[in-house]
Interface confidence: low
């Protein structure tokens, strides 16, 4: 069965496409401008919001703007968007967001009765994900994304774990092959880390990186295939 996403750029409208397609047809037309805002660091950016998680839009005086890796704690910054999840820009330096700001909330999207001041029209909008008036009603749990506050790893979306970041806990990405990891020397030593890392992804283990070009004293650990 066919659902066609035809572009209005291509000269054929979704309706025309539907007429010649057999079965089910979902016409999904792109906008008429090729200057739409797209995603990913391969593209120039105009704001931080166009970059992937953990990146910000760097606009040099000369050359094109691009999504750059976020700045960590104590690094220089000009705005909040430059700082990594769990930190914010204060007096030109990325500092940790306070615990109170990162406290998890019960998810909700409430409806409110709002009066339009210009026209005096009342609108009673029930746009809620839940009804707060019924505390025992079943509530959907919003899974945390990168940098979101959490209590345990089940609070985070797949591919992320709940790890300590200063004195709070946020969702961080599970480590992939070749990424630096933390080898646990003693059981429960995770509790001592201010910047806790996630474990390696399934099928990987945290092993010493045996590389002649790297100092043996450093004993860098990376995620490697079991």
């Amino acid at each position: 069965k066919l659902n066609s996403i035809k572009s209005s750029l291509g000269g054929e409208t979704p309706a025309q496409s539907a007429n010649r397609s057999a079965g089910m047809n979902q016409g999904l037309a792109f906008g008429g401008s090729k200057k739409g805002k797209s995603l990913g660091q391969a593209y120039p950016c105009s704001s931080d919001k166009e970059c992937e998680v953990g990146r910000y839009c760097h606009s040099p005086h000369q050359g094109s703007s691009a999504c750059m890796l976020c700045r960590r704690k104590k690094k220089r910054c000009h705005r909040d968007g430059m700082c990594c999840p769990g930190t914010r820009c204060n007096n030109g330096i990325c500092i940790p967001v306070t615990e109170s700001i990162l406290t998890p909330h019960i998810p909700a999207l409430d409806g409110t009765r709002h009066r339009d001041r210009n026209h005096g029209h009342y609108s009673n909008h029930d746009l809620g994900w839940q009804n707060l008036g019924r505390p025992h009603s079943k509530m959907p749990h919003i899974k945390g994304h990168e940098g979101d506050p959490c209590l345990r790893s089940s609070d985070c979306i797949d591919g992320f774990c709940c790890a300590r970041h200063f004195w709070t806990k946020i969702c961080k990405p599970v480590l992939h092959q070749g990424e630096v990891c933390t080898k646990q020397r003693k059981k429960g030593s995770h509790g001592l880390e201010i910047f806790q890392r996630c474990d390696c992804a399934k099928g990987l283990s945290c092993k010493v990186w045996k590389d002649a070009t790297y100092s043996s004293k450093a004993r860098l650990h990376v995620c490697q295939k079991i």
């Epitope: 750029l9 992937e52 940098g147």
Partner: antibody
């Protein structure tokens, strides 16, 4: 909920969010006419109120936010029968990477424009 | 929207074709999402990045495809799957949805 709006009298829809960092995610507004598909109106980023509107709605919809109450608003100007629809607010889903998919939706408000 | 009558247990396939690639070469992700909307309810995200199932979505919903051709498969349709299904490109603004497929 349901709303009856007089033609020409603007209406402001509100969408209150909690349970996540309101200023980190785009908030989308989507229109659905009876028995029809979904139409993206636009989105606003609460951090700085940057707005991206579907050109079709540039003279129809005005998106605003109130960071202090974690509430997004959409005002529809000079409503006509063509604006009779269900309007949803929907959160941008970060989903690990920056993405414009929508992972949480409001329950929708049915707006009927009639005299 | 087009509709399709199905029986419980049957395999359902819906396709979505784009005239522009939705593949982001920098991360090899296809920015195509699928939503389910039951009568009188809000849409629900089923699949994003073409094949990643949203948390809590039954594994009978399988998204596939790359570039311009995408498919949502329900491997064994259940009575509760009767709904409208929409595809959406979540790559570039303005965001756009498919016209929808009604599963009856």
């Amino acid at each position: 909920g349901a709303e009856l709006v007089r033609p020409g009298a603007s209406v402001k829809l509100s969408c209150k969010a909690s349970g996540y960092s309101f200023t980190n995610y785009w908030m989308n507004w989507v229109k659905q006419r009876p028995g029809q598909g979904l139409e993206w109106i636009g989105m606003i980023h609460p951090s700085d109120s940057e707005t991206r509107l579907n050109q079709k709605f540039k003279d129809k919809a005005t998106l605003t936010v109130d960071k202090s109450s974690s509430t997004a608003y959409m005002q529809l100007s000079s409503p006509t029968s063509e604006d009779s629809a269900v309007y949803y607010c929907a959160r941008e889903g970060r989903l690990g990477l920056r993405s414009y998919a929508m992972d949480y939706w409001g329950q929708g408000t049915s707006v009927t424009v009639s005299s | 929207p087009s509709s399709l009558a199905m029986s419980v247990g049957q395999k359902v396939t819906m396709s979505c074709k784009s005239s522009q690639s939705l593949l982001n070469s920098s991360n090899q992700k296809n920015y195509l999402a699928w939503y389910q909307q039951k009568p009188g309810q809000s849409p629900k995200l089923l699949v994003y990045f073409a094949s990643t199932r949203e948390s809590g979505v039954p594994d009978r919903f399988v998204g596939s495809g790359s570039g311009t051709d995408f498919t949502l498969t329900i491997t064994s349709v259940q009575a509760e799957d009767l709904a409208d299904y929409f595809c959406q490109q979540h790559y570039i603004t303005p965001l756009t949805f498919g016209a929808g497929t009604k599963l009856e």
